[in-house]
């Protein structure tokens, strides 16, 4: 009896050796194998030289093979698909010389910390590149220059703080770009050029709204129907555009597209981001109406019929789990591990509406129910009661001051404390007069009929940090109609540097060890995102993001960085958007 199962698909001999506890390649592999499944084995290392005699090989699946090293010295001239996902690769060898016909490369869910400038040299046929869920902190300039045929690029859920200018230059066919779940603070001027990118994912980053963000803001305003919010298990083409998912980390999660840019110099480069100032007709061609039909029409214009038509077997989502035995040639639809904003997590506290006003009507309390991955810990489902619109109550929370000797929660030099010993600094919160029901820490003022004012956020100046993440000063807001949030000033004991919040990709569970006192009403604001025990240096908290045109909001997981020195900036505007347990 042969080690592996043999079948045929679209004229290719398919050999399935999945999950056979193999430590090396089987000796009885058919010489005419076209599709080879080796996933879920314990190969440890792999070399293209092992397969040099398999001249028909077009698809090779090596996910979950515990690979720590990969060598690509021998040519596999027909190989089109290489799946290396869910392994332990810390570096990616240059594949172009050995695999010149490669069209799909999946190296997601590995441990890549960086890529060499020539990593993709010679991969001129590459159409899909999946690098999500790695440890990429930066990308070399010119990385994608050789891959001019690229259609799909996923860099989601890495640790990218910036993108090299010109990264997308020449990628005229790119139709889907995943950048969510990184530490990006801005987008370089001219980054998108004149690309007609139908699907872009940009949420769950630490976008910093100051004058440097204007190019990006303008691009968002011009392309609202190209920006999507990732939803687990949903085909990209079935998702709804959500430009409001891209939010200013330093301005109370206001949508980037609505950032007013007051006081910023009007710069030609910011406004005319793709050099179309003199050609308004071209501009209107790429504009979207907000209705579905216009979007569908647009999609039809820019999607390659051959690879991504509705009838096609190729889906437009990055592959994750292994292909079925019968149809291995095609990509797959789920991306576990992508940072998602769960649909079911809602809060009925409006703190930033998309028109930059706060609604005067009080929404009905909604019962919130989160559905994380199976966990023995119950989720918070208690609705947040809403007070009368006229009152602005705040939480009455007596939170004990930590012992002076212990590490405060929000200081940068975070050691790895046991969950039980994490202290919580005091939050001075006034007691509401009109209502006995405590509200979350976000006040909801009643706007006056003539204008849409919102109180400004006091911005405390932190002590000078040895590694300041953002050098742009936050200007003190002048009295204007610019909406801001009122938040109590956070008192952090012995805080000597900037606190940090980073994006995490961990499913939500309730962390009982950090729960505030029993007297505090349990709301969705107190939900925590717990990291796996293998990542001990993380703080756990949540920020709230309202859905587009709705008072509901969704939670984005946040966490601290691996090292104290590499923390992104946490503006004080965050202070009251975090769950009490954070403090």
């Amino acid at each position: 009896q042969p080690t592996c199962d043999v079948s045929k698909v679209t004229s290719l001999l398919e050999v399935n050796c999945e999950d056979k506890k193999l430590k090396k390649l089987p000796t009885d592999l058919p010489a005419d194998t076209g599709i080879l499944h080796l996933s879920k084995n314990q190969l440890g290392t792999f070399s293209t030289s092992y397969l040099v005699h398999f001249t028909h090989l077009t698809h090779l699946y090596l996910s979950r093979c515990e690979l720590t090293s990969l060598q690509a010295h021998e040519k596999l001239l027909k190989l089109e698909t290489l799946d290396l996902s869910h392994n332990h690769l810390q570096s990616l060898p240059s594949l172009g010389r050995a695999l010149p016909a490669l069209t799909t490369l999946d190296v997601s869910f590995n441990k890549l910390g960086s890529l060499s400038p020539g990593a993709l040299e010679g991969l001129g046929q590459l159409e899909e590149l999946y690098l999500q869920n790695n440890d990429l902190k930066s990308l070399p300039p010119g990385l994608l220059m050789p891959t001019t045929k690229l259609l799909k690029l996923s860099l989601a859920n890495n640790k990218l703080r910036e993108l090299p200018p010109g990264l997308l230059d020449g990628l005229e066919d790119l139709d889907t770009l995943y950048l969510q779940g990184n530490w990006l603070s801005t987008i370089p001027k001219g980054f998108f050029g004149s690309l007609l990118l139908p699907f872009v994912f940009l949420h769950a980053n630490t976008w910093y709204c100051d004058c440097e963000i204007l190019y990006f803001r303008n691009w968002l305003q011009e392309n609202p129907n190209r920006v999507y919010l990732w939803k687990e298990g949903v085909d990209v083409k079935a998702m709804t555009a959500n430009v409001a998912s891209v939010r200013c980390a330093n301005l109370g999660n206001a949508p980037v597209y609505s950032y007013p840019g007051k006081g910023c110099p009007t710069n030609e480069g910011d406004i005319d981001y793709d050099d179309y100032a003199d050609t308004p007709t071209t501009r209107t061609e790429v504009k979207f109406s907000t209705n579905t039909k216009a979007h569908t029409t647009y999609w039809g214009l820019f999607y390659s019929e051959s690879s991504t038509s509705p009838d096609s077997q190729m889906t437009s989502l990055p592959p994750i789990h292994e292909p079925t035995k019968k149809q291995p040639t095609f990509a797959h639809t789920e991306i576990p591990g992508f940072t998602t904003l769960p649909d079911t997590m809602e809060s009925n506290t409006a703190f930033y509406s998309l028109n930059n006003t706060v609604p005067t009507t009080t929404p009905e309390p909604t019962s919130t129910q989160a559905t994380p991955e199976p966990s023995s810990t119950p989720m918070l489902t208690t609705p947040v009661p809403t007070p009368e619109p006229s009152s602005i109550p705040m939480l009455t929370v007596p939170v004990s001051t930590p012992e002076p000797s212990s590490t405060p929660m929000l200081t940068t030099p975070v050691s790895t404390p046991e969950p039980s010993s994490i202290p919580m600094p005091t939050i001075p919160v006034p007691t509401p007069e009109p209502s006995s029901i405590p509200m979350p820490t976000i006040p909801v003022p009643t706007p006056e009929p003539s204008s849409t004012p919102m109180p400004t956020i006091p911005v405390p100046t932190p002590e000078p940090s040895s590694t300041p993440m953002f050098t742009t000063p936050v200007p003190t807001p002048e009295p204007s109609s610019t909406p801001m949030l009122t938040t109590p000033t956070l008192t952090t004991p012995e805080s000597s540097s900037t606190p940090s919040i980073l994006v995490s990709t961990i499913p939500p569970v309730l962390t009982t060890t950090l729960a505030p006192p029993e007297s505090i009403p349990k709301t969705v604001l107190e939900q925590f995102y717990t990291l796996e025990p293998t990542l001990p240096r993380t703080l756990e908290s949540t920020i709230i993001i309202p859905e587009q045109n709705s008072l509901n909001s969704q939670a984005v997981p946040q966490a601290s960085s691996d090292t104290p020195k590499s923390n992104p900036f946490l503006n004080s505007d965050f202070c009251c958007l975090l769950p009490l347990g954070f403090y």
Partner: antibody
Framework: QVQLVESGGGLVKPGGSLRLSCAAS????????MSWIRQAPGKGLEWVSS???????YYPDSVLGRFTISRDNAKNSLYLQMNSLRAEDTAVYYC????????????WGQGTLVTVSS | DIVMTQSPLSLPVTPGEPASISCKSS????????????LAWYLQKPGQSPQLLIY???TRESGVPDRFSGSGSGTDFTLKISRVEAEDVGVYYC?????????FGQGTKVEIK
């Protein structure tokens, strides 16, 4: 011209074995994938097994572990070893050639009848 | 396995008139890489072995009269005979050659009225 001639059919008891042969002529046998397809009396067509030009066999679940396809390129012959035969294996067995790497059947033999009955 | 369903199962025809047979697959037979649909048609005349008529949905095998044509994509396919002749009687089968196990339709018996 291409010719495929099957032989080896007959009456066999359930649980018994039988070996079918197919003699090929009129083409370069070693360059083509070959298959066996059967047709139960008064019924439709059912694929039984295939072997690639390189000699890799594959089967549907219904015969996997019971039937073995093989080829002898030197003799221009295709074989089907059938073990643990069942009543539902009763059919006319056709030898067929596939074109290139594709899996449609461009030439068929006249068939040989296999009857499994006690 | 991919299930192939033909209709009608029986088709009485008049010589000189057109005839049409439908074949549906339980999943798409379109290979997005080459935009080919992996479907073949065979005719088994009474007392004979099957003979290939069409492959890849619409490519006629050499020697097959041009009155036979195939069309369709994805999961819905059709074999058309523009003007039926007496020699066209027999059972017509569709077969998917997209992924193993190769499966056939149950057959459509074409007979002269």
């Amino acid at each position: 011209q291409v010719q495929l001639v099957e032989s080896g059919g007959g009456l066999v008891k359930p649980g018994g074995s039988l070996r079918l042969s197919c003699a090929a002529s009129g083409f370069t046998f070693s360059s083509f994938a070959m298959s066996w397809i059967r047709q139960a009396p008064g019924k439709g067509l059912e694929w039984v097994s295939s072997i690639t030009s390189a000699g890799t066999p594959y089967y549907p679940d219904s015969v996997l572990g019971r039937f073995t396809i093989s080829r002898d390129n030197a003799k221009n012959s295709l074989y089907l070893q059938m073990n643990s035969l069942r009543a539902e294996d009763t059919a006319v067995y056709y030898c067929a050639r596939s074109r290139g790497y594709e899996d449609y059947f461009d030439y068929w033999g006249q068939g040989t009848l296999v009857t499994v009955s006690s | 396995d991919i299930v192939m369903t033909q209709s009608p199962l029986s088709l009485p025809v008049t010589p000189g008139e057109p005839a049409s047979i439908s074949c549906k697959s339980s999943q798409s037979l379109l290979n997005s890489r080459n935009q080919k649909n992996y479907l073949a048609w065979y005719l088994q005349k009474p007392g004979q072995s099957p003979q290939l008529l069409i492959y890849f949905t619409s490519t006629r095998e050499s020697g097959v009269p041009d009155r036979f044509s195939g069309s369709g994509s994805g999961t819905d396919f059709t074999l058309k005979i523009s003007r039926v002749e007496a020699e066209d009687v027999g059972v017509y089968y569709c077969q998917q050659h997209y992924s193993s196990p190769w499966t056939f339709g149950q057959g459509t018996k074409v007979e002269i009225k």
